[in-house]
């Protein structure tokens, strides 16, 4: 499955929108930094077959979409930017779903992929728990926004590696 060029453009647009969503100066939030233990090895496309990498990307985008679709998220961000961001993510999910269906027919996805998807889910659980512990404060959301920008950047790099493999 060839991910369309529009997919990576969508990822870049999502990153730009997320970058614009900040409401407070991040400089006031240094003490709120937190180690979410991003599962970097899951974004290393070299160790995966294509189907696995696409599944990990899908899970990453799905979890990001879920995180920014909550009521607490709606209260934290400017509505029109949030809607545009969610739309970009939704489009990416559609692209990836088409690929998942196509690729899984070609390759059997081993248990290792389930571990990778679980690692991504646990990462987002840590993010959600942090927001709960910090009572969804503006600084907590700023820290999470920075973290998601970082993980989306990793996703973009994984997509680039996937295209080079084609």
């Amino acid at each position: 499955c060839d991910l369309p060029q529009t997919h990576s453009l969508g990822n870049r647009r999502a990153l730009i929108l997320l970058g614009q969503m900040g409401r407070i100066s991040p400089f006031s939030c240094l003490k709120d930094r937190h180690d979410f233990r991003i599962p970097q090895e899951e974004f290393d496309g070299n160790q995966f077959q294509k189907a696995q990498a696409i599944s990990v990307l899908h899970e990453m985008i799905q979890q990001t979409f879920n995180l920014f679709s909550t009521e607490d998220s709606s209260a934290a961000w400017e509505q029109s930017l949030l809607e545009k961001f969610s739309t970009e993510l939704y489009q990416q999910l559609n692209d990836l779903e088409a690929c998942v269906i196509q690729e899984v027919g070609v390759e059997e996805t081993p248990l290792m992929n389930e571990d990778s998807i679980l690692a991504v889910r646990k990462y987002f659980q840590r993010i959600t728990l942090y927001l709960i512990e910090r009572k969804y404060s503006p600084c907590a959301w700023e820290v999470v926004r920075a973290e998601i920008m970082r993980s989306l950047s990793f996703s973009t790099n994984l997509q680039k590696r996937l295209r080079r493999k084609d």
Partner: antibody, heavy 121, light 107 residues
Framework: EVQLVQSGAEVKKPGESLKISCKGS????????IGWVRQMPGKGLEWMGI????????AYSPSFQGQVTISADKSISTAYLQWSSLKASDTAMYYC??????????????WGQGTLVTVSS | DIQMTQSPSSLSASVGDRVTITCRAS??????LNWYQQKPGKAPKLLIY???SLQSGVPSRFSGSGSGTDFTLTISSLQPEDFATYYC?????????FGQGTKVEIK
């Protein structure tokens, strides 16, 4: 390879203006903040201020607020430190360094080589 | 502003010695504390971040500890290349602030 390359040494007269630069390469320039640090001759390190190149948001140390201006041009991955009217007491070595912002990563892990500014009549 | 106080301001030691430098913050900074090494005419170099994490490429003889207000940088066995000035810096709250430095000299 991550690098921060600063502009060369400057010799200026009191009252003159100056803009020094710090060019980042080998990493995503907008993913890190850039901080500026002053070191006067024979003295310690003093944090001056910081910029987020993604949106040019800045913060200054109260000691330097109004004395200097920090800016950035993300299209050329460069941050700037400028003075509108130099004083003899501005004579120092100025360093830029990258900061991970709100991400959990090492602070000021890469530094520029420094720009020596000498202000003398 | 958070004041950072280092002690001693200078010390003399021999190659192979165990060296300890302390840094005290005027209020709690959790573990948002970094240590830098600076040699004459050179830019500072990050040694330790988040109080105890060793920066990539830094020899394991350097270690950091502490949390809250009191922090320590330890060099387990001083090497000739370790003679330099060491600075602590808090990254808990703006303005970021440095300690005044500790100069490690040859005895």
């Amino acid at each position: 390879e991550v690098q921060l390359v600063q502009s060369g040494a400057e010799v200026k007269k009191p009252g003159e203006s100056l803009k020094i630069s710090c060019k980042g390469s080998g990493y995503s320039f907008t993913s890190y903040w850039i901080g500026w640090v002053r070191q006067m001759p024979g003295k310690g390190l003093e944090w001056m201020g910081i910029i987020d190149p993604s949106d040019s948001d800045t913060a200054y140390s109260p000691s330097f607020q109004g004395q200097v201006t920090i800016s950035a041009d993300k299209s050329i991955s460069t941050a700037y430190l400028q003075w509108s009217s130099l004083k003899a007491s501005d004579t120092a070595m100025y360093y830029c360094a990258r900061h991970p912002g709100l991400n959990w990563a090492p602070d000021f892990d890469y530094w520029g080589q420094g720009t020596l500014v000498t202000v003398s009549s | 502003d958070i004041q950072m106080t280092q002690s001693p301001s200078s010390l003399s030691a021999s190659v192979g010695d165990r060296v300890t430098i302390t840094c005290r913050a005027s209020q709690s900074i959790d573990d948002f504390l970094n240590w830098y090494q600076q040699k004459p005419g050179k830019a500072p170099k990050l040694l330790i971040y988040f109080a105890s994490s060793l920066q990539s490429g830094v020899p394991s003889r350097f270690s950091g500890s502490g949390s809250g207000t009191d922090f320590t940088l330890t060099i387990s066995s001083l090497q000739p290349e370790d003679f330099a000035t060491y600075y602590c810096q808090q990254s808990h709250t703006l303005p970021l602030t440095f300690g005044q430095g500790t100069k490690v000299e040859i005895k």
